[in-house]
Interface confidence: low
């Protein structure tokens, strides 16, 4: 048992030394636009980016370049700093993220933030088949055509669980939602892509209305739909929403496991040093016990 | 990205001159500094000058101070480094490199675009 006492007692040093080493850098800061990750060719956008307060300088890198600084002043008052693109064009368009310094220490890098620049070039034209108004369990497809020189089209549908279908083809590309539901009714809008940040105009909205019985509808809502003007603002709430939860689940989780870690090291040492301790309190009781024994057998001897 | 092309390099006897170009093309607005390297047969690539293509401000090596000087063009979007008095020991070959500057000054290594680099032989 004592034996094992120093290797069990290297473990947990080690351990707990990688945890501390774990330590050595910051929690990944959050990314984010505002108004939306999809900008309009000039207009302007601001890169959030929050970290801790106490923060001495915040480092926007672009396509893996340092791209902007900021030192935030007082630091101690401030965890957020916004970087502002007065004019947004196909140059700034790209993968950003961010990293924030305390004292000496470095964060982890942000997520990444895609950041696109729309209204480039044409206007793709979106229609679907069979039509716009459709049972449900019909199939339907929607087509998005566009005439200059574009491979990359994107299907997004306006609501709170929007999601970009990209599709492929030499001037249109066909999006198969396959037979649909009640959850598939709303607004649609389709892209064109010349590379992955470069998006044309959006195309005019097709409203998608699926009609099915009672129970249907019941089980499957409707997304909530906007008008076109706030064609920029659902998915940001979307965008922003998800990955704050998500790099706020990263943090969590990953402090949650180093301090359960912690804990079990610490767990584990104790109940093996209590182990020995109570180990050698008995092999200290035997050998009382045998002296004794042997001390009263002497006794005995001698008397006889 | 970036593209940078050096030209201008060749042979020259030892007092002699020779102008370096640099012509850079792609997203250049993302090109705050530009430099001149050079790396010898044998030897670690040397920094020679810097300039902040903003206001222009320019930075020497010691070993070229004074005999080299470091300028831009940009409506031609091109660097130029003017070499006077070369010696044999400058024969080496001659790199252009740009990035962004990294806390108000260029970065001491590590850049992210570089040219493919033009040959400078000095002879005596």
């Known amino acids: 048992m004592s034996s094992t006492l120093p290797a069990l007692l290297c473990v947990g040093l080690c351990l707990s030394q990688r945890i501390s080493a774990q330590q050595q850098t910051l929690p990944k800061p959050f990314i984010w636009a505002e108004p939306h990750f999809m900008v309009p060719k000039e207009k302007q956008v601001t890169i959030c980016c929050q970290g801790n307060y106490g923060a001495v300088e915040y480092q926007l890198h672009f396509e893996g370049s340092l791209f902007a600084v900021d030192r935030p002043k007082p630091p101690e008052r401030i965890n957020k700093v916004q970087f502002y693109i007065p004019d947004m064009n196909s140059r700034m368009a790209g993968q950003y993220s961010c990293i924030y310094r305390v004292g000496e220490l470095w964060s982890e890098p942000s997520n990444l933030l895609d950041l696109v620049v729309t209204e480039m070039y044409d206007t793709p034209t979106l229609s679907v088949h069979p039509g716009p108004e459709v049972i449900s369990g019909e199939k339907v497809t929607f087509y998005c055509r566009l005439d200059t020189a574009t491979s990359m089209f994107l299907l997004l549908k306006e609501g709170r669980s929007s999601h970009v279908q990209r599709g492929y083809g030499k001037v249109q590309a066909e999006f198969p939602l396959g037979p649909v539901t009640t959850a598939h009714r709303g607004t649609y809008r389709c892209f064109g892509s010349y590379n992955n940040h470069a998006w044309s105009f959006p195309s005019e909205p097709v409203k998608l209305l699926v009609t099915g019985d009672i129970e249907n509808t019941s089980l499957a809502p409707e997304d909530p739909t906007f008008p076109a003007d706030t064609w920029g603002t659902y998915l940001l709430t979307t965008e922003t929403g998800l990955q704050k939860d998500h790099a706020l689940w990263d943090h969590t989780a990953q402090n949650l496991l180093r301090m359960g870690l912690a804990f079990l090291v610490l767990v584990a040492l104790v109940w093996f040093l209590v182990e020995d301790w109570l180990s050698r309190k008995r092999t200290r009781e035997r050998a009382s016990r045998a002296s004794t024994w042997e001390g009263r057998r002497r006794l005995n001897t001698q008397t006889l | 990205e970036v593209q940078l092309v050096e030209s201008g390099g060749g042979s020259v006897q030892a007092g002699g001159s020779l102008r370096l170009s640099c012509a850079a093309s792609g997203y250049t607005y993302r090109t705050d500094c530009m430099g001149w390297f050079r790396q010898a047969p044998g030897k670690e690539r040397e920094g020679l000058a810097t300039i902040y293509t903003s206001d222009g401000r320019t930075a020497y090596a010691d070993s070229v101070k004074g005999r080299f000087t470091i300028s831009q063009d940009n409506a031609k979007n091109t660097l130029y480094l003017d070499m006077n008095t070369l010696k044999p020991e400058d024969t080496a070959m001659y790199y252009c490199?740009?990035?962004?500057?990294?806390?108000?000054?260029?970065?001491?290594?590590?850049?992210?675009?570089w040219g493919q680099g033009t040959l400078v032989t000095v002879s005596s």
């Open positions: 490199a740009a990035d962004l500057q990294y806390g108000g000054s260029c970065p001491s290594g590590g850049w992210k675009y």
